[in-house]
Amino acid sequence: MAVTACQGLGFVVSLIGIAGIIAATCMDQWSTQDLYNNPVTAVFNYQGLWRSCVRESSGFTECRGYFTLLGLPAMLQAVRALMIVGIVLGAIGLLVSIFALKCIRIGSMEDSAKANMTLTSGIMFIVSGLCAIAGVSVFANMLVTNFWMSTANMYTGMGGMVQTVQTRYTFGAALFVGWVAGGLTLIGGVMMCIACRGLAPEETNYKAVSYHASGHSVAYKPGGFKASTGFGSNTKNKKIYDGGARTEDEVQSYPSKHDYV
């Protein structure tokens, strides 16, 4: 039950995270005009990964796409790439994790297959989250660097440096959305990996032991110390360790050739 809950929660958290990464990638407010300690202008500038916008005091907003690929800074291209990779990995991870969910039965899929799929999706979510966090952090670093540049060469647009009126940019809402979404995707991925451990059947589990003492055969089930039913002073309490978590299906245990003492 705990495994199912962990897996389900991991899926939901990752789903929210990936939705957030997509939202952040599409948002226009990656950087917004810094209004503190700046000449107060009647226009408000903000920029995204794909276009820059200007909102006039009347509320009129005009956005222009970056219609050049070669003219854009390499850092911006890198951020775009990281976010897209994050989205793609996250989307594939979601698709894989849907089939891996314990609560969903697809044909005669074994638990080992589900465990592998859960692990795969978990890793994908972790990488997806890291990509998003990295992308947002690179952009944030770019903003901080440009913010402290000399006023003569103040950062005034994604297209490069323009010697014009000083317009400084600070962190936009998309950065915070991206950081939170990346974090959620990462957490969801970790939860999926944890759930995978609970789904995986162990090959080398010691499931049962036949113990011979005073002519009585006592079968010990895994699960800690058991009171002996044998007679005589040589009867001992033994703890048999189960190498991994058991699924509810494993009711019957079979001894292996190593289980006899």
Partner: antibody
């Protein structure tokens, strides 16, 4: 059609206050900024401030801060400009104007003007 | 505050001739985000309120005759009347529509020669 109708001429003594009204019609009152601009006799135009009737947000020219107050009454679609501690140099024609949408922060409609004379 | 300097103070032009009014701002009015100049031109006839002619330095307000045109970028701007008509006699003002407080030029009085 859009109209801005201002109140009549005023004669005030130095140190007094004056309140000029600007009644608007023909558009959604709460969606546009209203500016106040004055023009002293034979002089140029001087921006005093603006108000957004939808929220009551105001921006003032620092030159007038503390002396000018802009208010809006949404029930009558009217904006008021009150100027206190009047001096002789406040003698001017006071205009209200509407900031156009998508017109580069420009004022596309103007009231007819209200003459305020400050004299002892 | 941004200082707007207009030249000349007054201008006399013959009917049908070209009239040119200049405006210079103490700081650039170009917004890098949309590459637009936040400079406005107004026309004021005696006893009337100002009338919007041109915004964004070069965009004509609807209803304004096409003989009026605006140009320039950054700090230097020009209003041109290609063929002066009798009804164009007025005072013309340029306005900084970018920085608070909004500021106006001193005005240029246009007359017929």
């Amino acid at each position: 059609q859009v109209q801005l109708v201002q109140s009549g001429a005023e004669v005030k003594k130095p140190g007094a206050s004056v309140k000029v009204s600007c009644k608007t019609s023909g558009y959604i009152f709460t969606n546009y900024w209203i500016h106040w601009v004055r023009q002293a006799p034979g002089q140029g135009l001087e921006w005093m401030g603006r108000i957004y009737p939808g929220t009551g947000n105001t921006y003032y020219n620092e030159k007038f801060t503390g002396r000018v107050t802009l208010t809006a009454d949404t029930s009558t679609s009217t904006v008021y400009m009150e100027l206190s501690s009047l001096r002789s140099e406040d003698t001017a024609v006071y205009y209200c104007s509407r900031e156009g949408y998508g017109k580069g922060n420009s004022m596309d409609y103007w009231g007819q003007g209200t003459t305020v004379t400050v004299s002892s | 505050d941004i200082v707007m300097t207009q030249s000349p103070d007054s201008l006399a032009v013959s009917l049908g001739e070209r009239a040119t009014i200049n405006c210079k701002s103490s700081q650039s009015l170009l917004n890098a985000g949309n590459q637009k100049n936040y400079l406005t031109w107004y026309q004021q006839k005696p006893g009337q309120p100002p009338k919007l002619l041109i915004y964004w330095a070069s965009t004509r307000e609807s209803g304004v005759p096409d003989r009026f045109s605006g140009s320039g970028s950054g700090t230097d701007f020009t209003l041109t009347i290609s063929s002066l008509q009798a009804e164009d006699v007025a005072v013309y003002y340029c306005q900084n529509a970018y920085y608070y407080p909004y500021t106006f030029g001193g005005g240029t009085k246009l007359e017929i020669k």
